[in-house]
Interface confidence: low
């Protein structure tokens, strides 16, 4: 009803003589804000109907005092009892130590103002510590994780207990193999009070039938224990034996498979055999109780391998270990593997002889183009630096103590190398003349793989007619040497070939050797004929003056040059190809005026009153720069021109006249020329 109190605690609390009991307890008063005024704990209590009061042995009695705060814990200990609760909602108690005669009902009497309540609490206290309980699953299988729980309906702070696990009397700890975990827990609530330990592990099939014990300890002293026996279900455990494990071809072998153990037991002994993981069929078998025999007659090499047997129970199939059967036989037909192939010249090449044999081959014979290679008896043949002559077919023969094999397949070693002995060949008429058309061919001795392209240097020197053929149209006199390359995956260059183009002498010119300055009459003059280049180099020199051949030779010499030597000179150089003429070179000889003479116009007999012009004619280089005129008496007529004009003429002008001419070289004088002036008819008439 609304006037009832609510009090919660475990239905029964368990302990043993000398231990303690902690009673977890919660309460609610009918009045929400009521506070506990008095608390009593009775042992073996009764209700006195006359006095309407509870009587019995009081184990604990506490009343609120003025000093107590509103809701503080009482924390008062009276004898063996400690009240651990408060005045609001907690009525937890602890009795320490507990006695066996404390078994039965305790009465917890609580008063809050006008509200009162009596709560029975049942204790079960034994004289000796009681056994723990062990919980385990209904079925345990090998290698599958399983959890065992050991527990005790007891927990009391101040009296610590420890739960320990043992397998066949050996303590199990968290580091024991196959143990996943051991976890302990303590529960003390208003519903339950207990201590538990959980052991999680993966049992082995060999753990079947072993005892597992849980032990309760306090202060290193064993209080109680419980033991259970493991029933581990596992697949059949088989043992395989082979006799012999190594056998020569055509002999027989017996294999035995025994069922050593199984839980649950086998319903029927049905043993299956496997080789290299595959079931064996059509084999001679002998089945006995708990045993099966496999007999292999006339063993072949295909019978070598790993054998095992298998049998099943309700849990599943069980397998034996694998046992290897080795069948000895002579080497099988061999084949050769080449790494790398094709190989590059100079590379390291490895040839491996592959031949199945048991025992492994101990001796190998290698063949190159079916001829034995002396000295190499290993499985691997190494060519440190391969060359073209290593190419060809390789085979090998393997040998062991049972005999030797046969050659199954030869392997071809292909050696790749750049084209060898590359040359550039001129295929033209010789000598090659400037302006000719020239054909060049690129040749090589051998190549592997075949030549796929050609290159020419200098690039663009001609046009490629077809692979490996170059045509140079109109070859120049100064053509560069030409080189070709033949290429597969690599290029090999030929030495450059010189075209040796023949041409007429080039850049012919006249050089004045001496004198260093201007040439004057009477001096020694030396001219040289010069040229830049000529092919062939053998040449002849010729000199021409004003277009006419004057002499042969490289030099033209004048011992005492005269004005008559002046003119246009050409030097000409020729070889077997042609001749080349220099540009004209003008020889100028400088000399003083010479061959001076006075000429009179219109004649040397002129009538008075007329005009006469006297000209001073001469030969001079450079021309005369100054003239002087003289009469018959040697009188300077003070005229400096080339011409002397007399006008009008008088008879007195009759006489001889001379002229003198001067240039930068010297002076020349003419012989006298006579002018006769005669009287005119008028003058004669007057007389």
């Amino acid at each position: 009803s609304a006037n009832d109190w609510t009090v919660d605690h475990p239905q029964t609390l368990f302990a043993w003589e000398g231990a303690c009991i902690r009673i977890p307890c919660k309460y609610k008063t009918p009045l929400p804000k009521a506070r506990l005024d008095n608390i009593l704990l009775f042992q073996n209590y009764e209700f006195d109907k006359a006095t309407k009061k509870f009587t019995g042995t009081v184990l604990y009695n506490a009343t609120k005092t003025e000093k107590d705060p509103e809701s503080e814990l009482y924390l008062s200990k009276q004898g063996r009892v400690t009240f651990l609760g408060n005045r609001i909602d907690n009525c937890t108690l602890k009795i320490h130590p507990i006695r066996a005669n404390d078994s039965g009902n305790l009465g917890l009497r609580m008063t809050a103002g006008t509200e009162r309540w009596m709560e029975p609490i049942h204790l079960n206290v034994s004289e000796k510590p009681f056994q723990p309980y062990i919980q385990m699953p209904s079925e345990i299988r090998e290698s599958q994780s399983v959890t065992l729980t050991c527990g005790l309906n007891f927990s009391c702070f101040g009296y610590d207990i420890l739960l320990k696990w043992f397998l066949e009397d050996s303590e199990i700890t968290s580091i024991t193999s196959s143990v996943t975990s051991i976890t302990s827990s303590v529960t003390s609530s208003i519903k339950n009070v207990y201590t538990e330990s959980k052991l999680t592990f993966q049992p082995k099939w060999t753990d079947h039938g072993k005892s597992v014990k849980c032990q309760v300890q306090h202060s290193s002293k064993v209080l109680s224990e419980r033991t259970v026996r493991l029933d581990v279900k596992y697949t059949p455990k088989l043992e395989i034996k082979v006799n012999p494990t190594e056998v020569e071809k055509n002999n027989s072998v017996t294999m035995t498979c025994r069922v050593n153990s199984s839980n649950p037991k086998l319903r029927t002994v049905a043993v299956s055999w496997f080789k290299d993981g595959r079931p064996l069929e059509d084999q001679e078998l002998e089945q006995e109780q708990q045993m099966s025999k496999l007999i292999l007659h006339s063993v072949t090499k295909d019978m070598r391998g790993k054998y095992r047997c298998q049998a099943s129970n309700d849990i599943g199939p069980g397998e034996s270990e694998e046992v290897e059967l080795t069948v000895h036989y002579a080497p099988e037909p061999s084949r050769v593997h080449i790494y790398p192939s094709p190989a590059e010249e100079g590379q390291s090449v490895e040839l491996i002889c592959e031949s199945l044999a048991s025992p492994s081959a101990t001796n190998y014979t290698w063949y190159h183009n079916r001829k034995p290679i002396p000295g190499d008896t290993q499985e691997k043949l190494r060519i440190p630096k391969v060359s073209p002559w290593h190419a060809g077919n390789y085979s090998c023969l393997a040998e062991n103590r049972l005999g030797h094999g046969k050659i199954d397949q030869e392997a071809k070693l292909d050696v790749h190398y750049a084209p060898k002995a590359v040359t550039t060949v001129i295929q033209s008429f010789t000598p090659i003349l400037e302006g000719d058309s020239v054909t060049l061919v690129c040749r090589y001795n051998s190549s592997n793989p075949d030549v796929t392209s050609y290159r020419w240097n200098p690039q663009g020197s001609g046009s490629v007619l077809k692979p490996g053929v170059l045509r140079i149209q109109k070859v120049t006199w100064d053509s560069m040497p030409v080189s070709c390359a033949a290429c597969n995956h690599k290029c090999s260059w030929a030495l450059p070939v010189i075209l040796n183009v023949h041409y007429a002498p080039r850049d012919v010119k006249v050089l004045k050797v001496s004198p260093a300055s201007e040439i004057r009459a009477g001096q020694r003059v030396l001219l040289q004929c010069d040229f830049a280049e000529s092919n062939p180099a053998e040449v002849r020199f010729f000199w021409k003056k004003n277009g006419s051949l004057v002499q042969e030779g490289r030099y033209l010499s004048f011992g005492s040059v005269s004005p008559e030597d002046s003119g246009n000179y050409n030097c000409m150089v020729n070889n077997s190809i042609g001749e080349t003429l220099s540009q004209a070179w003008n020889l100028q000889v400088l000399y003083a005026p010479r061959r001076l003479r006075v000429s009179i116009s219109p004649g040397d007999h002129v009538m008075e009153g007329k005009k006469a012009t006297l000209s001073c004619e001469s030969d001079a280089n450079p021309p005369i720069s100054q003239y002087t005129w003289f009469d018959s008496s040697g009188q300077d007529l003070h005229s400096s021109g080339q011409k002397l004009r007399l006008e009008p003429l008088e008879v007195q002008h009759t006489g001889s006249y001379r002229c003198k001419g001067t240039n930068g070289i010297g002076t020349g004088e003419s012989p006298p020329s006579t002018l006769t002036v005669y009287y005119s008819p008028e003058t004669i008439g007057k007389r």
């Epitope: 790494y339 790398p340 390291s348 490895e350 190494r382 630096k385 995956h489």
Partner: antibody, heavy 120, light 112 residues
Framework: QVQLQQPGAEIVRPGTSVKLSCKAS????????MNWVKQRPGQGLEWFGA????????RYNQEFKGKATLTVDTSSTTAYMQLSSLTSEDSAVYFC?????????????WGLGTTLTVSS | DIVMTQAAFSNPVTLGTSASISCRSS???????????LYWYLQKPGQSPQLLIY???NLASGVPDRFSSSGSGTDFTLRISRVEAEDVGVYYC?????????FGGGTKLEIK
């Protein structure tokens, strides 16, 4: 264990030559090729060439053929690379690296490298 | 010469995640003998290069199985399944199908 020991640094003047060394130990010297690899500061790797110590057979990267000459001294199990006509372009770290005879030819052990500085 | 091409930097990866590094060759490295002559080397800071993978997919001795490599004749990928701090460095691919042996320019593995 296999070790390839190289001097830490070399400083030379332009126009001169230098001979870098690589001392091999921990294996049969004549059973493996010795390679030389160049690495300019902050740059990638360039293969210079290789030498077979068993017969001094050489393979060069044509780009460097005039620059480098590879030799070995089998008595001291040392490989050498001589670099000639040095310029600043030759300043780099030079590694020696071992490779096997087979076609796989990968560089399985490397020296710590010699830093070459060409400076006037 | 066979040219090996690599990106200079990888995409930044978080420790514990996977990373991929690519490499391309100018010519197929698949030999007629079925072997692909492609190699991967790792150069950790301040150290010599070390071999990781030989003949495209074979793990060198002592290299963790976090490393793997695959590819065709010309395109190759190095994978690191769970990147660790010690994997930092420059990864070089290399070929030895033909002389001269050549290396890629290297890819620097970057950690976020």
């Amino acid at each position: 264990q296999v070790q390839l020991q190289q001097p830490g640094a070399e400083i030379v003047r332009p126009g001169t030559s230098v001979k870098l060394s690589c001392k091999a130990s921990g294996y049969t010297f004549t059973d493996y090729w010795m390679n030389w690899v160049k690495q300019r500061p902050g740059q990638g790797l360039e293969w210079f060439g290789a030498i077979d110590p068993s017969d001094s057979y050489t393979r060069y990267n044509q780009e460097f053929k005039g620059k480098a000459t590879l030799t070995v001294d089998t008595s001291s199990t040392t490989a050498y690379m001589q670099l000639s006509s040095l310029t600043s372009e030759d300043s780099a770290v030079y590694f020696c690296a071992r490779s096997d005879y087979t076609y796989s030819f990968y560089f399985d052990y490397w020296g710590l490298g010699t830093t070459l500085t060409v400076s006037s | 010469d066979i040219v090996m091409t690599q990106a200079a930097f990888s995409n930044p990866v978080t420790l514990g995640t996977s990373a991929s590094i690519s490499c391309r060759s100018s010519k197929s490295l698949l030999h007629s003998n079925g072997i692909t002559y492609l190699y991967w080397y790792l150069q950790k800071p301040g150290q010599s290069p070390q071999l990781l993978i030989y003949q495209m997919s074979n793990l060198a001795s002592g290299v963790p199985d976090r490393f793997s490599s695959s590819g065709s004749g010309t395109d190759f990928t190095l994978r690191i399944s769970r990147v660790e701090a010690e994997d930092v460095g420059v990864y070089y691919c290399a070929q030895n199908l033909e002389l001269p042996w050549t290396f890629g320019g290297g890819t620097k593995l970057e950690i976020k």
